[in-house]
């Protein structure tokens, strides 16, 4: 199964989850660190506002489970958020899900390796309970806590690699690219949007690869 | 393109030491954890232990515990798994692969066979 | 205990569906991952993280879970799935891998 297999139209697209908009967008008062996508985003400002809150109303997530998260590990997950709410440049990496809460997830979007590796690095020193944080919580309080049995541990006890935090942490919603920033061949979490998107570039390629790889199997399976 | 090549097929006399290598390449070898696994002929699939690629830590099943250490070459993007006091039963292709995320092996070496006989 | 246990051996018709299953309390709390093993051949992981589909893995095959059971569905099974499958998990007490004993899948017809 590829990528996007479930979409034909992969370019400027929001995904069908629960706050997206079902267009992307100018959107001119983004918030913080989210403000990156404020020239076309798929999240509103008040998602944007929210995503930003310990335990926000979005998802009743909290990033404390295990005491204080530190900060510079925090802006990460942040960011994380920012990609996932805001971004219109993951429609490759769109698949269909029947989930009670959304329609649509991202998997393996090819994160650029040094926001994995800084990712992994500034959160050496947190504390949680989980290696994957869709599942397994215990929410009976209506915010996620620890499960029974589930220690608080440092961040590298459960992700002992950068890849095992990237890729196992939202159940493969990433992979870890080989590329690196700037190649346009991986999505940066992090950018200067001074600059324009980055992340445009990365879409169109991948999509463009995409269509001929379908090309490809259309061609194989006429003759055959 | 990932790919992980691992040395030739090893026959061992019982008592003696074996040491596999698992060269890996098109990935960043220090982002992921490799793991050993191995398969006696006709028998499922055994975990040995794993290597952090990063900082060289390592995990090994209680039952190889003693016996097995994983080791890692990162200038040469390389491990190691060495078994020592080799018995009959220890006969078996031995397996590395990469891990994604605790388990999700999606790379998988080709399979070194060690025979261990008098 | 950290076992994952599995039918030593199922079979399905040409075309047919067919289910199998992982058991063990690791899953509970921890995604089971799914390989096929042909004969002389290294193993191929056919899903991870419980549902998702490996690049090149026909979507015939899908993964699902309830409680501390795993299932690999393979809807309209081909004479290419006849092979062996394994489950794996995670167990979080010491960051250790378990593997199932395995199921032989016969594909009839």
């Known amino acids: 199964a590829d990528p996007g297999q479930d979409r034909t139209d992969l370019l400027n697209v929001c995904m069908d989850a629960k706050h997206h908009k079902t267009k992307p967008g100018p959107e001119d008062k983004l918030h913080d660190q989210c403000s990156p996508w404020k020239k076309n985003a798929c999240c509103t400002a008040s998602t944007s506002q929210e995503l930003h809150k310990d335990t926000s109303r979005l998802y009743n997530f909290n990033w404390d489970h295990c005491g204080k998260m530190e900060p510079a590990c925090k802006r990460h997950f942040i960011q994380d958020t920012c990609l996932y709410e805001c971004s219109p440049n993951l429609g490759p990496w769109i698949q269909q899900v029947n989930q009670s809460w959304r329609k649509e997830r991202f998997l393996d979007v090819p994160l650029c390796k040094e926001d994995c590796q800084r990712w992994w690095e500034d959160c050496h020193t947190s504390h949680t309970c989980k290696s994957n944080w869709h599942r397994g919580w215990d929410w009976t309080s209506g915010v996620n806590k620890c499960p029974a049995g589930a220690l608080c541990r440092t961040f590298e006890s459960y992700f002992p690699t950068p890849a095992a935090l990237c890729e196992g942490l939202w159940s493969h919603s990433y992979k870890v690219s080989n590329y690196s920033r700037g190649s346009g061949r991986c999505i940066q979490m992090w950018f200067d949007s001074a600059q324009g998107n980055p992340n445009e570039e990365v879409a169109r390629f991948y999509a463009a690869a995409m269509h001929v790889n379908a090309g490809e199997m259309l061609h194989h399976h006429h003759h055959h | 393109e990932v790919q992980l090549v691992q040395s030739g097929a090893e026959v061992k006399k019982p008592g003696a030491s074996v040491k596999v290598s698992c060269k890996a390449s098109?990935?960043?070898?220090?982002?992921?954890?490799m793991h050993w696994v191995r398969q006696a002929p006709g028998q499922r699939l055994e975990w040995m232990g794993w290597?952090?690629?990063?900082?060289?830590?390592?995990k090994y099943s209680q039952k190889f515990q003693g016996r097995v250490t994983i080791t890692r070459d990162t200038s040469a993007s390389t491990a190691y798994m060495e078994l020592s006091s080799l018995r009959s039963e220890d006969t078996a292709v031995y397996y590395c692969?990469?891990?994604?995320?605790?388990?999700?092996?999606?790379?998988w070496g080709q399979g070194t066979l060690v025979t261990v006989s008098s | 205990s950290s076992e994952l246990t599995q039918d030593p051996a199922v079979s399905v018709a040409l075309g047919q569906t067919v289910r199998i299953t992982c058991q063990g309390d690791s899953l509970r709390s921890n995604y089971a991952n799914w390989y096929q093993q042909k004969p002389g051949q290294a193993p191929v992981l056919v899903i991870y993280g419980q549902f998702n589909l490996p690049s090149g893995i026909p979507d015939r095959f899908s993964g699902s879970s309830s409680g501390n059971t795993a299932s690999l569905t393979i809807t309209g099974a081909q004479a290419a799935d006849e092979a062996d499958y394994y489950c794996?998990?995670?167990?979080?007490?010491?960051?250790?891998?378990?593997f199932g004993g395995g199921t032989k899948l016969t594909v009839l017809g």
């Open positions: 290597i952090n690629a990063g900082n060289g830590n390592t």
């Open positions: 098109g990935y960043t070898f220090t982002y992921y954890a």
């Open positions: 794996d998990s995670r167990v979080s007490t010491g960051n250790h891998v378990v």
């Open positions: 692969a990469r891990d994604i995320s605790y388990g999700s092996f999606d790379y």
